[in-house]
Each structure stands twice: as structure tokens, then as C-alpha cells.
Interface confidence: medium
């Protein structure tokens, strides 16, 4: 019996087609992805093959103006239209709190939404009961397939799930649910979840009875053969893991942003054992037409976004590099722009002793979600900025001791090189790292811009001095592992909306040209 698994993950609000780097589509003939194009391909496969499942491994939420405006209603509507069979909860599904998940998505989705390792407690338990499930048994042709969901246990550190959801260890939570499916005579089981490729592989190895793992969160691109676009494969598709009980378990992921549709064919024997697995992600490029009906629907929903998207805020005459490849590894000019805007927004309280009350900015590189291409006539719109800063956060003012800042910068590079989000972009700070040293001892120079001075200059950080710093509320709340900020901050004042801060700055400057200038070495 053959099953076709179609899968997406980390779509991040890319409902419309995008450019090759998943930013706003400029040249339609070269654009990719989007739900209208995805629907065309999905329906083509559904017509051609008898046993097809369409699955999503989480993080539909967050990423463009669509989420900023519609707050998840767009996810439910278009996933319903595409007739997804199941979805796993990702960490970003909690970005607007639990209410922002329940109302627009959980109550509106016409497909099961899954996570076995999220347990509700307190008053939330009855409110959310049945709205998401640990697993679902789905009819596929004349057979039965069990789908069991999981979500990153790091979600409380990455998003806003509140205090009434407990995120358990994925493997510990999955095993009893898989066992339950086995007692129900379900012998074909897919683990669908959002914890990253390393955890996906661990689930394949450790959870007895899981036949296939469909993952997300790490934006992992797997491919067998010559890859069709810019993404470099992290391994073959599917990636085969040998389980502890000796089975070959295929693990798949489909990069991100709806650029690819994962396509995996699994052959099962009559006892539900995987005999063979093969496939590849399908690049959703312009050779696949956009479905006219879905496209019309997109255009109808788009009307509400036009106030956001059409107004030019200012121009850039340089490429604004907001790519993960840059901002999570080194100083990037998008990070510099944002930090400069954050400081500019806080230009106040000057007197004869202080040129400004605050001179420093830190910004987690993982919070920068998109580049802006200057070749679109240099135009910068609200929509461009919403793709860069999609989280709807605020830029806040905190007071920290120098010793806390030093810990933060050590944390910034404690696991450098893994494309994790905690790498800090800065303003009013010069930092030098020595990555050959052991984690926790890599900051060799940390100079900060003085405030109590008529001519601003950089002085060494003093461990016992108290400094004001502008940073995203995400960091002030200990996000991306910056627990030391949350635990040790001396004062926290919430600030202005992040996109508004940057848009105001760009409007004020009219033309921008931020550089990489040696803030981070």
C-alpha cells in the first residue's frame, strides 16, 4: 500500500508568492510559492495519486503583513481552502498568546491541529479542550493512518504561550500516544511536529512505532540529487534514521516560506512496516501556475492590506541585508539600521551633562526575518518592514548592570555557527569575539558609547555600572535564552511598536544607506 505525503513547514505567513529569497515578490515571472501555486500542485497530485495526505508541521503564523493584519484568520481560511489534512502546532502559533491561537485558528480550522506534548492546566484546560489533539486517525483510501503531533519544548522561551500550557519533552510525551494508536490497530504512524531536525531524528530513533517523521522549525532543506534553487541540502531526502529497534525511519522537512512542497512516497507492507520511501521537495516556481480561484480569493483578502503596503516610507540606495546567513553570524546592515532607528526613537532628556539618556541597542539576529532589495526602485513600504519585523513587538528601555550585558554577549556566541537567533546585532556598542575560546569566555573586548559626554566616544564596559539599553521586548522577557536579562534587569519600561519605530526613522531620514562598519568583530 502506497502513501503520498505532501508537507509544508515554517510557511510564516507567505500567502502570496515571493521572490527567490522569500521576500516580497518583485518580478512575478521569477516568483515562487504562495498558496495559489501550492494549491495547483497539491490538486494535481491528488488527482494523479490515490492515497494523499497534505500535512503542515507548524509555524504558519508570523512573517508578513498578512499576519500583522489578519492575526491567523488568514491561516485558517487558506489552509481550509487547500484542504490540509492535519497541522502540528509550531512555537509561532503562540505569538499572540493562547487567545490569538484559539480564536482565529483552533476554532476555525477544518482539519485536526495536533500536539501531544502540550498539556493545558488551570482555567485554560476546559477552554482549550478538544481544540487541539495529541493525535488523529485519518482515513486514507481504504487504510488508516495515525498522525501524532509535537511542538518544541522551547516554546515558552520563543513565544508567548502563557503560564497555563506545559510543554513536555517530545519523546516522553509521544511514546504513550503512539502506543495508544497501536492498541487501536493503527499500524501506520506519522510523527508530525515542530521541534527542529535534531529532535526529528531523535524521535525517529527513540519513539517505538513511528514510521515517518515530518518536521519543521529548523528550516532544514533536504534533497536527493542536484538542488533546484539556492538552498544547500543538509542531507538526502528523505533522511533515513535507524531506530533503536532496527527500523529504517524516513525523516523529512521542506525548508520554509512555502517555497517547496515536500513530496514523500512511502510503501507499506500489510503489517504497516515501511518497505521503501523516496521523493524530493518540489520547488514551487513560476512553471506551476497559480490557481485562479485561490488567487482571486487572495486578491480579495489583499484589499485590507493595501493601506499598509502601498505607502512609500522612504528609500534605500543599498541592499538591506536581513538574511539569516548574515544577521545570525555577523554584523549586518539591517541590524545596524534597526538599532540606529531604536536609538533615534529615544533621543530625549538631553542636558548639559548627557547628550542623550541612552546610547546602546541590542537586537537578536533571529528577530530580523527578511532582507529588503533596493532594486525595487529603492522603495521601502510598511509591508517590507512587516516582513523584516513580523512579530508585532515593542522596542523597550531597560536598565542593566555591565555584568549582565557581558553575560548577554557571551550568550550571543555561546553556540556560534548553528544559525541560532541569539547572535546580537548592536548599536552604540563595539564588541570583539574570539571564537577559538571556550563558550562563556569569548568576549575579549566590549566598548560602549558614552552618554555622559558632549562628544560621544567608546569606553570599556564597567561591570558594576548601570546602563540603559534599548532592546526588543522579546529580549527583555528573556527570549532566545537571554534569561540573564529578564532575571537581572533593574528597570523595564515598555516602548513603541517595532515596525513603527523603524518606519518613522526611515520617513525622517528619507534616504538611507546603512553600512557594515565594524561594530562586531
Amino acid at each position: 500500500w502506497e502513501l503520498t505525503i505532501l508537507h509544508t513547514n515554517d510557511v510564516h505567513s507567505r500567502l502570496e508568492q515571493t521572490s527567490e529569497d522569500s521576500s516580497k515578490c518583485v518580478n512575478a515571472s521569477r516568483c515562487m510559492g504562495g498558496v495559489a501555486r501550492l494549491f495547483t500542485k497539491v490538486q494535481q497530485i491528488r488527482r494523479a495519486e490515490p492515497n494523499v495526505l497534505l500535512l503542515d508541521a507548524g509555524d504558519q503564523y508570523q512573517g508578513t503583513i498578512w499576519f500583522t493584519v489578519y492575526k491567523g484568520a488568514e491561516v485558517a481560511h487558506f489552509m481550509n481552502a487547500l484542504r490540509y489534512d492535519a497541522m502540528a502546532l509550531g512555537n509561532h502559533e503562540f505569538d499572540n498568546g493562547v487567545e490569538g491561537l484559539i480564536e482565529p485558528l483552533l476554532k476555525e480550522a477544518k482539519f485536526p491541529i495536533l500536539s501531544a506534548n502540550i498539556k493545558a492546566k488551570g482555567p485554560l484546560a476546559s477552554q482549550i479542550s478538544g481544540l487541539y489533539l495529541p493525535y488523529k486517525v485519518l482515513p486514507v483510501g481504504d487504510e488508516v493512518v495515525g498522525i501524532v503531533g509535537y511542538t518544541s519544548k522551547e516554546t515558552p522561551f520563543l513565544s508567548n504561550p502563557g503560564t497555563n500550557l506545559v510543554f513536555e519533552d517530545e519523546i516522553t510525551a509521544l511514546q504513550p500516544e503512539v502506543d495508544k494508536l497501536k492498541t487501536l490497530n493503527v499500524n501506520k504512524i506519522i510523527a508530525l511536529g515542530h521541534s527542529g531536525f535534531e529532535t526529528d531524528k531523535l524521535i525517529a530513533q527513540k519513539v517505538r512505532g513511528v514510521d515517518v517523521v515530518v518536521g519543521g522549525h529548523s528550516n532544514t532543506f533536504l534533497y536527493t540529487g542536484n538542488p533546484p534553487s539556492k538552498e544547500v541540502p543538509a542531507g538526502k531526502y528523505p533522511f533515513i534514521v535507524t531506530s533503536d529497534d532496527g527500523r529504517k525511519v524516513p525523516v523529512v522537512q521542506a525548508y520554509a516560506f512555502g517555497k517547496y512542497l515536500g513530496y514523500l512516497k512511502i510503501e507499506f507492507d500489510e503489517r504497516g512496516n515501511v518497505i521503501s520511501s523516496h521523493g524530493n521537495p518540489i520547488l514551487l516556481n513560476s512553471s506551476i501556475p497559480e490557481d485562479p480561484s485561490i488567487k482571486a480569493d487572495i486578491n480579495k483578502w489583499r484589499i485590507k492590506l493595501d493601506n499598509y503596503s502601498t505607502q512609500e516610507l522612504g528609500k534605500t540606495i543599498v541592499y538591506l541585508d536581513g538574511s539569516s546567513q548574515s544577521c545570525r553570524f555577523r554584523e549586518c546592515n539591517m541590524g545596524n539600521l534597526i538599532c540606529d532607528a531604536m536609538i533615534n526613537n529615544n533621543l530625549r532628556h538631553a542636558d548639559e551633562m548627557f547628550w542623550n539618556h541612552v546610547s546602546m541597542c541590542i537586537l537578536n539576529g533571529g528577530g530580523i526575518r527578511s532582507p529588503i532589495d533596493e532594486r525595487n526602485n529603492g522603495t521601502i513600504t510598511w509591508e517590507n518592514l512587516a516582513a523584516v519585523l513580523p512579530f508585532g513587538g515593542t522596542f523597550d528601555l531597560v536598565q542593566l548592570k555591565g555584568s549582565t550585558l557581558k553575560k548577554a554577549f557571551e550568550h550571543s556566541v555561546h553556540r556560534y555557527g548553528q544559525s541560532t537567533g541569539e547572535f546580537l546585532q548592536v548599536g552604540g556598542i563595539h564588541v570583539v569575539y574570539d571564537l577559538s575560546r571556550k563558550p562563556g569566555d569569548r568576549v575579549v573586548k566590549l566598548d560602549v558609547l558614552c552618554t555622559k559626554c558632549r562628544v560621544p566616544s567608546y569606553d570599556p564596559l564597567k561591570m558594576d555600572e548601570i546602563y540603559k539599553v534599548i532592546l526588543p521586548n522579546f529580549l527583555a522577557n528573556g527570549g532566545d535564552g537571554f534569561q540573564m536579562i529578564k532575571d537581572e534587569l533593574l528597570r523595564h519600561d515598555s516602548g513603541d511598536q517595532d515596525i513603527n519605530v523603524v518606519s518613522t526613522y526611515i520617513s525622517k531620514m528619507k534616504v538611507i544607506y546603512p553600512a557594515v562598519e565594524g561594530r562586531i568583530k
Epitope: 494549491f39 490538486q43 491528488r46 488527482r47 481550509n80 481552502a81 484542504r83 489534512d85 492535519a86 480550522a109 477544518k110 482539519f111 485536526p112 491541529i113 488523529k136 486517525v137 485519518l138 482515513p139 483510501g141 481504504d142 488508516v144 490497530n185 490557481d291 480561484s293 485561490i294 480569493d297
Partner: antibody, heavy 121, light 107 residues
Framework: QVQLVQSGAEVKKPGASVKVSCKAS????????INWVRQATGQGLEWIGW????????KYNEKFKGRVTLTVNTSISTAYMELSSLRSEDTAVYYC??????????????WGQGTTVTVSS | DIQMTQSPSSLSASVGDRVTITCRAS??????LAWYQQKPGKAPKLLLY???TLASGVPSRFSGSGSGTDYTLTISSLQPEDFATYYC?????????FGGGTELEIK
């Protein structure tokens, strides 16, 4: 309110074809499958097939394959069922029904009033 | 194809009675089962889905149970408006077949 309104009764000769319409209102027509079910006088219900209005995707009961054609006109939110090569045993009330798919748990939640098709020489 | 067999085919009862109708599938339908009520000359009306979930607006005297191949519709206390024909339907593999119906009449 949500409703499905079907066309009027039809009398046909054996070998002819019949086309029954089902007009939807009160909801987004393209978001739900339309199913067709028939019921011979004094008999039970028999599922014929469904169509997904958004793109015309269809699934038929093998028993009717080749004789039944399901179509839609989304501009007027109307679904059609055409049955050809009619025989006397096709005499029945034909219903359209909307299939809800909430959370993967399926059911027919809204039904048309039914269209009586009589096949007689 | 999965066949659905309903029993009894007809049933006489009085107002206030507790009534049970059963539906047996020829294969496991994994709770993908709906119950409908039909009155003469009218279209069927959804009562329950997912074997046991009450449809919107349906009185709580109606309940469903079962799993695998055997399912039950129970009316805890018959009301005059409940006299009708009842059908089960599975949504497992197509074709989605209905049971033959159970006619509930006044004793």
C-alpha cells in the same frame, strides 16, 4: 441563513438525461464540498458523489461512474448533478448536501429540499 | 465497500421511553459516523457526528456511543417530535454508505 435550494421535479423517459441544480446561499460556496444523495420511494439513502466547488475536484461512487457528472458554476454559487442513460430504477428524490469538514470529522450539515426525478416511458 | 446494517428496522415506543438504535459496519469505521433524522417528505437532519458529538441545536436527549464496527444512537426520553426515521452513515473509505434506516413509530 445557510441554505441549499434545489430545482423542481423532473419527469424523464428511459435513456434520457436529467440535470438537477442546487443553489447555495448564506456561506462561502467555494469552501465546502457539495455531495449528492438519492432516495428511492420508501427506501434508504444512497451517496452518489461530491464536488469541491473551488476547483471542480470530484469523487464518485463507483456505482454511478460514467453516468453521473457533477459540475459547479461558482459565479452563481450553484452545483449541478447530471445523470444520463436513465432507467426506471433511477426514480428517486435527489438531494444535495453540504459536507462540513470541521477538524477532520465529517458530516452533512445542510441539505437541499430534494428534487423528485421520475423515469417513466 | 463497507456495508452499514441498522437494527431494528422499525420500532414502536411511547413518549418518555428510552430508545436505542444500533448500527453495525462491515469494517472498522474509526468513529467516522454520523446519525440523521428524517421525517416524511423532508430532507434528513444531522443529529450527531464523530459517533458521539452532538450537532448544533440538537437536544441533549440524543446521544451516541460506540467504536470500531458497532455504534449506538440513544434517545433518553422520547418526545412527540422524535417519531421519524433514523439513519447512520459512515465517512471512512468511499463510498460513504448509509444504514437501511430505523423507523420509530408511536406505540
Amino acid at each position: 441563513q445557510v441554505q441549499l435550494v434545489q430545482s423542481g421535479a423532473e419527469v424523464k423517459k428511459p435513456g434520457a438525461s436529467v440535470k438537477v441544480s442546487c443553489k447555495a446561499s448564506g456561506y462561502t460556496f467555494t469552501s465546502y464540498d457539495i455531495n449528492w444523495v438519492r432516495q428511492a420511494t420508501g427506501q434508504g439513502l444512497e451517496w452518489i458523489g461530491w464536488i469541491y466547488p473551488r476547483d471542480g475536484f470530484t469523487k464518485y461512487n463507483e456505482k454511478f461512474k460514467g453516468r453521473v457528472t457533477l459540475t459547479v458554476n461558482t459565479s452563481i454559487s450553484t452545483a449541478y448533478m447530471e445523470l444520463s442513460s436513465l432507467r426506471s430504477e433511477d426514480t428517486a428524490v435527489y438531494y444535495c448536501a453540504r459536507k462540513e469538514g470541521y477538524r477532520g470529522d465529517w458530516y452533512f450539515d445542510v441539505w437541499g429540499q430534494g428534487t423528485t426525478v421520475t423515469v417513466s416511458s | 465497500d463497507i456495508q452499514m446494517t441498522q437494527s431494528p428496522s422499525s420500532l414502536s415506543a411511547s413518549v418518555g421511553d428510552r430508545v436505542t438504535i444500533t448500527c453495525r459496519a462491515s469494517g472498522n469505521v474509526h468513529n467516522y459516523l454520523a446519525w440523521y433524522q428524517q421525517k416524511p417528505g423532508k430532507a434528513p437532519k444531522l443529529l450527531l457526528y464523530n459517533a458521539k458529538t452532538l450537532a448544533s441545536g440538537v437536544p441533549s436527549r440524543f446521544s451516541g456511543s460506540g467504536s470500531g464496527t458497532d455504534y449506538t444512537l440513544t434517545i433518553s426520553s422520547l418526545q412527540p417530535e422524535d417519531f421519524a426515521t433514523y439513519y447512520c452513515q459512515h465517512f471512512w473509505s468511499t463510498p460513504w454508505t448509509f444504514g437501511g434506516g430505523t423507523e420509530l413509530e408511536i406505540k
